[in-house]
Amino acid sequence: IWELKKDVYVVELDWYPDAPGEMVVLTCDTPEEDGITWTLDQSSEVLGSGKTLTIQVKEFGDAGQYTCHKGGEVLSHSLLLLHKKEDGIWSTDILKDQKEPKNKTFLRCEAKNYSGRFTCWWLTTISTDLTFSVKSSRGSSDPQGVTCGAATLSAERVRGDNKEYEYSVECQEDSACPAAEESLPIEVMVDAVHKLKYENYTSSFFIRDIIKPDPPKNLQLKPLKNSRQVEVSWEYPDTWSTPHSYFSLTFCVQVQGKSKREKKDRVFTDKTSATVICRKNASISVRAQDRYYSSSWSEWASVPCS
Amino acid sequence: RNLPVATPDPGMFPCLHHSQNLLRAVSNMLQKARQTLEFYPCTSEEIDHEDITKDKTSTVEACLPLELTKNESCLNSRETSFITNGSCLASRKTSFMMALCLSSIYEDLKMYQVEFKTMNAKLLMDPKRQIFLDQNMLAVIDELMQALNFNSETVPQKSSLEEPDFYKTKIKLCILLHAFRIRAVTIDRVMSYLNAS
């Protein structure tokens, strides 16, 4: 058993049929010694008396808010949560496996630049009685500071018969140098509590590996005289690290119709303009990627050909 | 990167071109190592990230773009020792900090070159003959060092008398290649920045 936060405790349980469970001793936070009784949740049934209560925690029915009272007055609370371990593996029931970039990916993180700011998100089908708490650091043995905000519900989607909820959090490394060469990864830890179930999820990464620039901005077309070709130009996204001559991007320019199966024109360039063939009912799209370290491409920025 | 090959800038351009070749060569070699040594811990997640130049050179600090010198987090350990000018910059562009930066890059390359050559000598003794260093990568390191043209004492190649542990050597190769790729990215950024200045 360990303390998650004040008056909230996590009991780690090996979860299998007829498991013996864990013996837990609760102590009432009071100078009083006599006349103390214990109840669980909303029930008025007295579970025991005295300053301490010993319980055998085996299942979710044994978890919950234990309260000690004296003469009708509440003295203190202890909330017990369960963390299940099945076949030596901690449960991951609360969050959905995003399976990208590999199986057992519950947390996904992205950074728009090298400033040390990044966003992580996760998915769940649970809509109520759900709380998250996020901590992060650079390295684990001698951790350096990373400050994370509160996790918020950022999107709701319908997937078949189910509703899916996306939560996200923004974090900022306390003293980040955009030009630094990372040798210690960022560690992100998410505590998830659903009703009386506790789970934790972690992710470890280098900022350089989670870079995904914003799409290029200000796409403009200039038809070329006596030609099917158009010159398309764009600018670096505002959120990209500066100076751009140091943090350079490379671009992919594509002309395609509405369907992915349609024919296309595609060219890669390090410049902020390119010449392509425009077709009726097609769009010109441009996306960006770090020129020197191939992490993710940005989303496409598009303009219609006409 | 977009300058025509026929008329390179007499200043930075040769170094820019060589640094691009360097990054391509080390990325290629790292990819090859990851494929060939698929049953060894050779991915970024599996290896320890070591920097053999740590406390010996200060490339990131010495080559920091002017725009980032206002960022206190980038200024932990800027060194200011005098280093003579290399040939990559036309003299009108040369400044004390640039010379220090290019000299630091040169020292990085020299250290990695020694490590890679020592390692290759060991890998050549491996009866499995599983992996060797790409001669192109070694040649590209050499070309960039020549383009930088700093005078510096030659570092003797390390020789070891004991029987090499090939498993450890291959893991060290992965560690070295990951670190060198990161440094090659920095070098490429620096050359691109200096070329644009």
């Epitope: 070709q229 490379t250 349609e262 024919k263 296309k264 024109d265 595609r266 060219v267 890669f268 | 300058l3």
Partner: antibody, heavy 118, light 107 residues
Framework: EVQLVQSGAEVKKPGATVKISCKAS????????LHWVRQAPEKGLEWMGW????????EYAPKFQGRVTITADTSTDTGYLELSSLRSEDTAVYYC???????????WGQGTLVTVSS | DIQMTQSPSSVSASVGDRVTITCRAS??????LHWYQQKPGKAPKLLIK???QSISGVPSRFSGYGSGTDFSLTINSLQPEDFARYYC?????????FGGGTKVEIK
């Protein structure tokens, strides 16, 4: 299977015009760009131009501008290359090639030898 | 027009050898470069697109690399069926242009 089948060999006199065909099968003809590339004996490959069969848009290499016409007939799924004012240096194998991407060549015809000789 | 220069123009090698062919562009073409194999009397066949992207059905012993002006095609362990002529082609701008070709012949 995506296939391009070209018409047979031609022998032409200098100054004449040649028209070769390229019949597509195994895909929707207008879904791919169609290019023509030639190869003189013991020489390299030379791109001549492309057509978008969907709308008839064409683009030609400056070297052949004014002498070459590329057309496409969507009713027969056939592309054509017409080269006029033939000279001996036009002796070559002419290939049609197709792709959903405009700038490289995924599927090739078997080639048509055009000999220009007096 | 962008000139593409291939080297060497021919290379003699044995089965099992590692062969590298290079291609240089007269100006930067990013990764807009493709490789083809051509056997005598046959049409070319696409091997690699955009400098390093593999083509389905092409053996993994063929690999491409490079960007900007310098590119290479490597055949890792030469097989009897690999003796042919190889061409690079740039797609950075029109007109599309090819390298002069490299003949890989039996030693």
């Amino acid at each position: 299977e995506v296939q391009l089948v070209q018409s047979g060999a031609e022998v032409k006199k200098p100054g004449a015009t040649v028209k070769i065909s390229c019949k597509a099968s195994g895909y929707t003809f207008s879904d791919y760009y169609l290019h023509w590339v030639r190869q003189a004996p013991e020489k390299g490959l030379e791109w001549m131009g492309w057509i978008d069969p969907e709308n008839g848009d064409t683009e030609y290499a400056p070297k052949f501008q004014g002498r070459v016409t590329i057309t496409a007939d969507t009713s027969t799924d056939t592309g054509y290359l017409e080269l006029s004012s033939l000279r001996s240096e036009d002796t070559a194998v002419y290939y049609c090639a197709a792709n959903k991407e405009l700038r490289y060549f995924d599927v090739w015809g078997q080639g048509t030898l055009v000999t220009v000789s007096s | 027009d962008i000139q593409m220069t291939q080297s060497p123009s021919s290379v003699s090698a044995s089965v099992g050898d590692r062969v590298t062919i290079t291609c240089r562009a007269s100006q930067s073409i990013s990764i807009n470069l493709h490789w083809y194999q051509q056997k005598p009397g046959k049409a070319p066949k696409l091997l690699i697109k955009f400098a390093s992207q593999s083509i389905s059905g092409v053996p993994s012993r063929f690999s491409g690399y490079g960007s900007g002006t310098d590119f290479s095609l490597t055949i890792n362990s030469l097989q009897p069926e690999d003796f042919a002529r190889y061409y690079c082609q740039q797609s950075n701008s029109f007109p599309l242009t090819f390298g002069g070709g490299t003949k890989v012949e039996i030693k």
